[in-house]
Interface confidence: low
C-alpha cells in the first residue's frame, strides 16, 4: 500500500477555493523528489495539472499552486475559482505519475444554493449552537414573533413567542425578545443536528405589514483532520469541544464499516481492549478540552476517529464532535523493539526504548501504565536520576546503547511488576512506545547473596554466580544510586558448584570491598552485557555495621539467602496527572530518592581471584 496519504473526498461549491494536503514519509529522497497533482482520465492515465517543479496546466493557470513542506513531510495543493468542471478523480503523489506513490482524491464541486435576496447565511458545525437574528419594525414590536423552516413549498412552524416549540427542537431551542427599544429578536438553537440544515424564515407580525428575514442554516459535519503517524509510534488527539460541554462525559470513538462509532475510551471508564496498555485519556482542562494518547500504533488502528461529549459517553446526534482520519505509515522511522519482555520472579528485565536519534539530549522517562478509569502513567524513573522510592535499588535508566535507544533495567521482579510500561522523552511525542512485562515461571540465572552485613574497616567479598550460557558475556558489578549504577572493579573466578549441569563452565564473578567504609552501604548489582546491550542483573543490599570482628569477611554462596530481606520502602507510585506525559518537565519539582552516598572508590573495590572451592568454608 502506498505511504502517501490525503483526503479521500473533497467537496466545495462553485466559486469557492479548496486546499488539499497530502502527506508522505519525510525521507531524504522523498523530501526532494517531484510532487504532483494530476487528474485521472477515462483511459486511466493521470494528466499533471500542477507540480512542485513549477508546471501549471493551462486550465489551472492563475488559480492553482502546489507548495512542498519537506520538514513536515507534506505538500498542499490550493485551487481557487472552482467550477463544476473541476469535479472528478485526482491523485496527489511523488515521483512520476504512473508510479504507485500516490493517493486517490475525489473532488466534487456543486452548484451553490439559489437563495432569496438578503438571506443571512449561518455556517455551523454539528452539535454546536447557532443564534439567528431577526429584525422587525416598531409597529410589529407587540405582535407575535416566529421562526419557520421552509421544506419544499411549505413552511413549518419551529418556535413562536406564544410558547409553541416544534417537537423536533424540544429542549434545545429558545426565542429571546429584547427589552423596549431593541428592534431585533433572536432564536438560539443548541446541539445542532444535520437535519436542522436548511432555509429558515423569521417573521414578526402578520398581514402585509409583517417583517420577514430569510436565514440559510448550513450544518456541517466536521472536516476530519488528517493525521499521519508512523507504525509503532504514538498519536495524540486534542479535543476541544467548548465550554458548554465542559462538565459532560467525553469520549473518543472509531467509525466502523457500518458507519456507527465504537467507543475507544471515555471518561466513564470504558476502554476498548484492543488499546489495553497503550492509551491514556488526559484529564480535561477547565475549558472542557482533553486529549487522548495512543502508543504502539498498528496498521489496524487506521481509520476515522471522533471525539465528543455526551452524558452516556458515546456518540449521540446533535452533540459536538471533532474528527480525525488516521493513516499509519508502514515505512516507519521508529525501529522495531520487543513489545513483550519476559522475566522470572526474582530475576530482571532489560527494556530497550527507542527515541528520536536527532534528540540525543532529550530527557528520557519510563512510566507504569495504570488502566483504571481514564488511564494514567506515573513516572518511575528519568534520565536525570529520579527513581520512585519503592523502586530503590532495583530500577535504573541508562543512556546506552545511545543513537536512538536507551535502556531501562528492572530487577528483583515480582508478579506485581507485570504490566504495561511506556518509554517517552520530553522531545518528539510521536516516539512514545509501549512494552508489556510478563512474569513467567523460572529461576533467575544470576545468583547473589540475599542480604549482606559488612563490618567497618574489614574486607567484604560478594560472589555472583552465572551459568555457562553467559560465559561469553561481559560481567560487571556496579553500585546503584538514584542517578545510575557505577561500575566497580570485579573479576571472574574459578568454577562454581552453583550450577550442577555445567560445573566446569559455570563461573563466579566477585566484588571485594577493602576496607569497608560507611559509604559502601547500599545496593550493588551483578550483571551481564554484550557491548552496550544489557542482559540480566541481580541485586544485593550491603548493610554496614560498627561491630569489630577479626579476620576477613566473605559471603559464602552456600549460606547466602536466596533473596534480599524485603523492606517496606517509604514510597508509592507517583500519582501525577497525565498532563505530565505531554510535558515531563512538570516533574522537576517532585522529590527524588536521596543518593545513597559516595560511590565506592575504585581503589578500595578490589579483586579477589581465588576460587569458590578454596573459600567454601568461609563463614558469612
Amino acid at each position: 500500500k502506498s505511504p502517501v496519504f490525503g483526503p479521500q473526498e473533497v467537496s466545495s461549491v462553485e466559486g469557492n477555493s479548496v486546499s488539499i494536503k497530502c502527506y508522505y514519509p519525510p525521507t531524504s529522497v522523498n523530501r526532494h523528489t517531484r510532487k504532483y497533482w494530476c487528474r485521472k482520465g477515462a483511459s486511466g492515465r493521470c494528466i499533471t495539472l500542477v507540480s512542485s517543479e513549477g508546471y501549471v496546466s493551462s486550465n489551472y493557470a492563475g488559480r492553482a499552486n502546489l507548495t512542498n513542506f519537506p520538514e513536515n513531510g507534506t505538500f498542499v495543493v490550493n485551487i481557487a475559482q472552482l467550477s463544476r468542471d473541476d469535479s472528478g478523480h485526482y491523485k496527489c503523489g511523488l515521483g512520476i505519475n504512473s508510479r504507485g506513490l500516490s493517493f486517490d482524491v475525489s473532488l466534487e464541486v456543486s452548484q451553490g444554493p439559489e437563495l432569496p435576496n438578503g438571506t443571512e447565511v449561518y455556517t455551523v458545525d454539528v452539535g454546536r449552537t447557532v443564534t439567528i437574528k431577526c429584525p422587525f419594525k416598531t409597529e410589529n414590536a407587540p405582535k407575535t414573533k416566529a421562526l419557520y423552516k421552509k421544506i419544499g413549498q411549505t413552511s413549518v412552524l419551529v418556535i413562536d413567542s406564544r410558547n409553541y416549540v416544534n417537537p423536533n427542537y424540544k429542549d434545545r431551542i429558545r426565542l429571546r425578545i429584547p427589552g423596549t427599544g431593541q428592534l431585533i429578536f433572536t432564536v438560539v438553537i443548541d446541539r445542532l443536528r444535520l437535519s436542522d440544515h436548511g432555509l429558515y424564515l423569521c417573521q414578526a407580525g402578520d398581514g402585509s405589514n409583517r417583517d420577514e428575514k430569510n436565514a440559510d442554516l448550513q450544518v456541517l459535519e466536521p472536516e476530519p483532520e488528517l493525521v499521519y503517524e508512523d507504525l509503532r509510534g504514538s498519536v495524540t488527539f486534542h479535543c476541544a469541544l467548548g465550554l458548554e460541554v465542559a462538565n459532560v462525559a467525553k469520549f473518543l470513538c472509531r467509525v466502523n464499516s457500518r458507519e456507527t462509532c465504537d467507543v475507544v475510551i471515555n471518561t466513564l471508564g470504558k476502554r476498548d481492549s484492543a488499546f489495553e496498555g497503550r492509551i491514556l485519556l488526559n484529564p480535561q482542562d477547565k475549558d472542557g478540552s482533553f486529549s487522548v494518547v495512543i502508543t504502539g500504533l498498528r496498521k489496524e488502528d487506521e481509520g476515522r476517529y471522533l471525539c465528543g461529549a455526551h452524558s452516556d459517553g458515546q456518540l449521540q446526534e446533535g452533540w459536538p464532535i471533532q474528527a480525525w482520519q488516521l493513516f499509519v505509515n508502514e515505512e516507519s522511522t521508529i525501529p522495531r523493539s520487543p513489545t513483550v519482555v519476559k522475566g522470572v520472579a526474582g530475576g530482571s528485565v532489560a527494556v530497550l526504548c527507542p527515541y528520536n536519534p536527532k534528540e540525543s539530549q532529550s530527557l528520557k522517562y519510563w512510566c507504569l501504565w495504570e488502566g483504571a478509569q481514564n488511564g494514567r502513567c506515573p513516572l518511575l524513573v528519568e534520565s536525570q536520576g529520579l527513581v520512585q522510592e519503592q523502586y530503590e535499588g532495583r530500577l535504573s535508566l541508562l543512556q546506552e546503547p545511545g543513537n536512538g535507544t536507551f535502556t531501562v533495567i528492572l530487577n528483583q521482579l515480582t508478579t506485581q511488576d507485570a504490566g504495561f510500561y511506556w518509554c517517552l522523552t520530553n522531545g518528539d511525542t510521536r516516539w512514545r512506545t509501549t512494552v508489556e512485562i510478563k512474569i513467567i515461571e523460572g529461576e533467575p540465572n544470576l545468583k547473589v547473596p540475599g542480604n549482606v552485613t559488612a563490618v567497618l574497616g574489614e574486607t567484604l567479598n560478594i560472589p555472583c554466580h552465572f551459568p555457562c550460557k553467559f560465559s561469553s558475556y561481559e560481567k560487571y558489578w556496579c553500585k546503584w544510586s538514584n542517578t545510575g549504577c557505577q561500575t566497580l572493579p570485579s573479576q571472574d573466578e574459578g568454577p562454581s558448584e552453583a550450577f550442577v549441569n555445567c560445573d566446569e563452565n559455570s563461573r563466579l564473578v566477585s566484588l571485594t570491598l577493602n576496607p569497608v567504609t560507611r559509604a559502601d552501604e547500599g545496593w550493588y548489582w551483578c550483571g551481564v552485557k554484550q557491548g552496550h546491550f544489557y542482559g540480566e542483573t541481580a541485586a544485593v543490599y550491603v548493610a554496614v555495621e560498627e561491630k569489630k570482628v577479626a579476620g576477613s569477611r566473605y559471603v559464602s554462596p552456600a549460606k547466602a539467602d536466596a533473596a534480599p530481606d524485603e523492606k517496606v520502602l517509604d514510597s508509592g507510585v507517583r500519582e501525577i496527572e497525565n498532563k505530565a506525559i505531554q510535558d515531563p518537565r512538570l516533574f522537576a519539582e517532585e522529590k527524588v530518592v536521596a543518593d545513597t552516598g559516595d560511590q565506592a572508590g575504585g581503589s578500595r573495590a578490589s579483586v579477589d581471584s581465588s576460587s569458590s572451592e578454596e573459600q567454601g568454608g568461609s563463614s558469612k
Epitope: L368, E370, G371, A372, Q373, G375, R376, P378, Q388, E389, Q390, Q416, G419, V568, L569, D570, S571, G572, V573, R574, E575, I576, E577, E590, K591
Partner: nanobody
Amino acid sequence: QVQLVESGGGLVQTGGSLRLSCAASGLTFSSYTMGWFRQAPGKEREFVAAISWGGASTWYADSVKGRFTISRDNAKTMVYLQMNGLKPEDTAVYYCAKGRNNGYATAVRAYDYWGQGTLVTVSS
C-alpha cells in the same frame, strides 16, 4: 471540606476477620492515593496499606502482607481494608488517610487528611 469516616472495627478472636470501610467526601476521591495506618497504645502511628489513584498499585507493611487486602471503589468514594488471620499484635486504632500525591505511599508525612479512627481489638 475533606471528611474521612472509618467503620467496621470491633472485637475479634485470633485468626478472625474484619473488613474496615472508609467513606470519603469533600474531595475528588478518584485523584488520590488512599492509605490505612494504625496506632497501638503507647506506640507511634504506623503504615498498614495504601492504594493508588486507579487501584493498580498497592503497598503493604511487611507485618500484614498476605493477610490484609486494600481495595477501593471510586464510584462510591470508598476505601476498604479486608483483614484476615488477625493476631493480637494487630490490636490498634486504624486510621484512613488521604494521600498528598507526592509520590510516597508508605510514610505518615505523605498524608494530609485523617479520619477519627476505628478500634480493632484482637483477643487471644
